[in-house]
């Protein structure tokens, strides 16, 4: 983890780097190493892909250990084959508003995902996709023999879109903060984004934290219930502790994970709250990060990696967030 | 963020009349009804009236004399009135979307007293 | 005038399974009552849980299922959570209104 001992590197040849990522000397100038992208963890020895800008950042002085890759102030960002600077928003499709910042792109949806429960006034609640209409619209169908208008008993009618306000005025700052992003990782730990104003200076800043969808170990397939096909949430297993680059948090907690699905749908958190977590390291150095930790999960066909980004990013994010 | 928010007088006097305005957020009064239910002290939740999403309205039979319920849809409101007054309306009101009555008000309450 | 009747209190271990019911004083519950189910943690807003007797709000747990039972409303909480205990209150629709009942405090042992 840090430079202190002897250069130690693997007997075989140089990695193989994916597309696109840098191979690079370790932060001791020892080993070659695939260099770490925007958003991933780094420490000293895995350092940040320097051709793309990219440096690792410790945060506060107490977290020397690990980092995350961060783009050096006023880095551009490519989305979608266009480069934007630093600070500029643009509308991505018609149902997202995004943000550039250092090298990181927040976008929050224009579209309403508020959820419909049955009741007289709308008994078969559905989200439909209209012509020419971006944002998906509430349509309450009827039943088929109602003739009497009342609260049950309209006629089909097409429901008016809108939109929650994704904004709040404060003190002469619209304030904005994206949703946190879906987390890097589907199994074990990862890291969850979002771009924000919501401070004193009314500055748009990046914030980070720490999340893990599902232990990579755990087979939760094997859970499944004969004829089900999914576990939005598993049982709640024995606590635990995190373990961060060597480094173990100082608790234990029984944290909830999401589940998995057989059917082919994704199975992500719907509910969080971030909350700060001590890690201890094995030279006893203490850091705390913060971390994401789930409250709902849900099932869904929008997975990571779909055709529609931007529908994939919509679905994927993290919202509810407590914190 | 779907919010509802009470809002009216703390005190009336007995044969009063009172007046309630619930002002949403984050949804559309033509979208989802809007429902105005109490809870006396130490008792249990009581439903008085719901105005539609297309403005039809439906009131608690034991009241129905003394409601009105109007709403304001460019404005986000819904109003409740309640005439005469007793001390034994004193209550916590609260207004909460149609649908399952998933969002509620944090609620307002009124003491009937003279 | 109807009635609509839950158990005053009911008590449960973490990890159990306990069921609210729901009684309609004029007869069977049905899907036309389109039960609801609220609930209300000490010093904490009201919520809706389940509206249109089974369906859940989003922020719902999947531990928490709405059904009918013998002619009555039921909520059912399976895996039991400290964080369970509160008041649940469930209303059923007449055609021209809503009655609530009169609410069930459900508590978590330990």
């Known amino acids: 983890q840090n430079c202190s001992g002897p250069c130690r590197c693997p007997d075989e040849p140089a990695p193989r780097c994916p597309a696109g990522v840098s191979l690079v000397l370790d932060g001791c100038g020892c080993c070659r190493v695939c260099a770490k992208q925007l958003g991933e963890l780094c420490t000293e020895r895995d350092p940040c892909d320097p051709h793309k800008g990219l440096f690792c950042h410790f945060g506060s002085p107490a977290n020397r250990k690990i980092g995350v890759c961060t783009a050096k102030d006023g880095a551009p960002c490519i989305f979608g084959g266009t480069v934007y600077r630093s600070g500029e928003s643009f509308q991505s499709s018609c149902k997202y508003q995004c943000t550039c910042l250092d090298g990181a792109v927040g976008c929050m949806p224009l579209c309403s995902m508020d959820v419909r429960l049955p009741s007289p006034d709308c008994p078969f609640p559905r989200r439909v996709k209209l012509p020419g209409k971006c944002c998906e619209e509430w349509v309450c169908d009827e039943p088929k023999d109602q003739t009497v208008v009342g609260p049950a008993l309209a006629a089909y009618r097409l429901e008016d879109t809108f939109g929650p306000d994704p904004t709040m005025i404060r003190a002469n700052c619209l304030v904005q903060t994206t949703e946190w992003s879906a987390c890097s990782k589907t199994c074990g730990m990862g890291i969850s984004t979002r771009v924000t104003n919501d401070n004193a200076s009314c500055r748009l800043e990046k914030q980070s934290r720490l999340c893990m969808v599902r232990p990579c170990e755990a087979d939760l397939e094997e859970n499944i219930k004969k004829g089900k096909k999914c576990i939005r949430t598993p049982k709640i297993s024995k606590p635990i502790k995190f373990e961060l680059s060597g480094c173990t948090s100082m608790k234990t907690y029984r944290a909830k994970f999401c589940g998995v699905c057989t059917d082919g749908r994704c199975c992500t958190p719907h509910r969080t709250t971030t909350l700060p977590v001590e890690f201890k390291c094995p030279d006893g150095e203490v850091m705390k990060k913060n971390m994401m930790f789930i409250k709902t999960c849900a099932c869904h066909y929008n997975c990571p990696g779909d055709n529609d980004i931007f529908e994939s990013l919509y679905y994927r994010k993290m919202y509810g967030d407590m914190a | 963020e779907v919010t509802l928010k009470e809002s009216g007088p703390v005190l009336v006097k007995p044969t009063e009349t009172l007046t309630l305005t619930c002002t949403v957020s984050?949804?559309?009064?033509?979208?989802?009804?809007v429902h105005w239910i109490r809870q006396p002290p130490g008792k249990a939740l009581e439903w008085l009236a719901v105005?539609?999403?297309?403005?039809?309205?439906d009131y608690n039979a034991a009241f129905m004399s003394r409601l009105t319920i109007s709403k304001d849809t460019s404005k986000s409101q819904v109003v409740l009135t309640m005439t005469n007054m007793d001390p034994v309306d004193t209550a916590t009101y609260y207004c909460?979307?149609?649908?399952?009555?998933?969002?509620w008000g944090q609620g307002t309450t009124v003491t009937v007293s003279s | 005038e109807t009635v609509v009747t839950q158990e005053p209190s009911l008590t449960v271990s973490p990890g159990g399974t306990v069921t609210l019911t729901c009684r309609s004083s004029?007869?069977?519950?049905?899907?036309?009552?389109?039960a609801n189910w609220v609930q209300q943690k000490p010093g904490q807003a009201f919520r809706g849980l389940i509206g249109?007797?089974?369906n859940r709000a989003p922020w719902t747990p999947a531990r928490f299922s709405g059904s009918l039972l013998g002619g009555k409303a039921a909520l059912t909480l399976s895996g039991v959570q400290p964080e369970d205990e509160a008041e649940y209150y469930c209303?059923?629709?007449?055609?021209?209104?809503?009655?609530f009942g009169g609410g069930t405090k459900l508590t978590v042992l330990g």
């Open positions: 105005i539609w999403r297309r403005g039809g309205t």
């Open positions: 209303a059923l629709w007449y055609s021209t209104h809503y009655v």
């Open positions: 249109g007797t089974s």
């Open positions: 909460a979307r149609d649908g399952g009555f998933d969002y």
């Open positions: 984050g949804f559309s009064l033509s979208t989802f009804g």
């Open positions: 004029i007869g069977a519950v049905t899907t036309s009552n389109y």
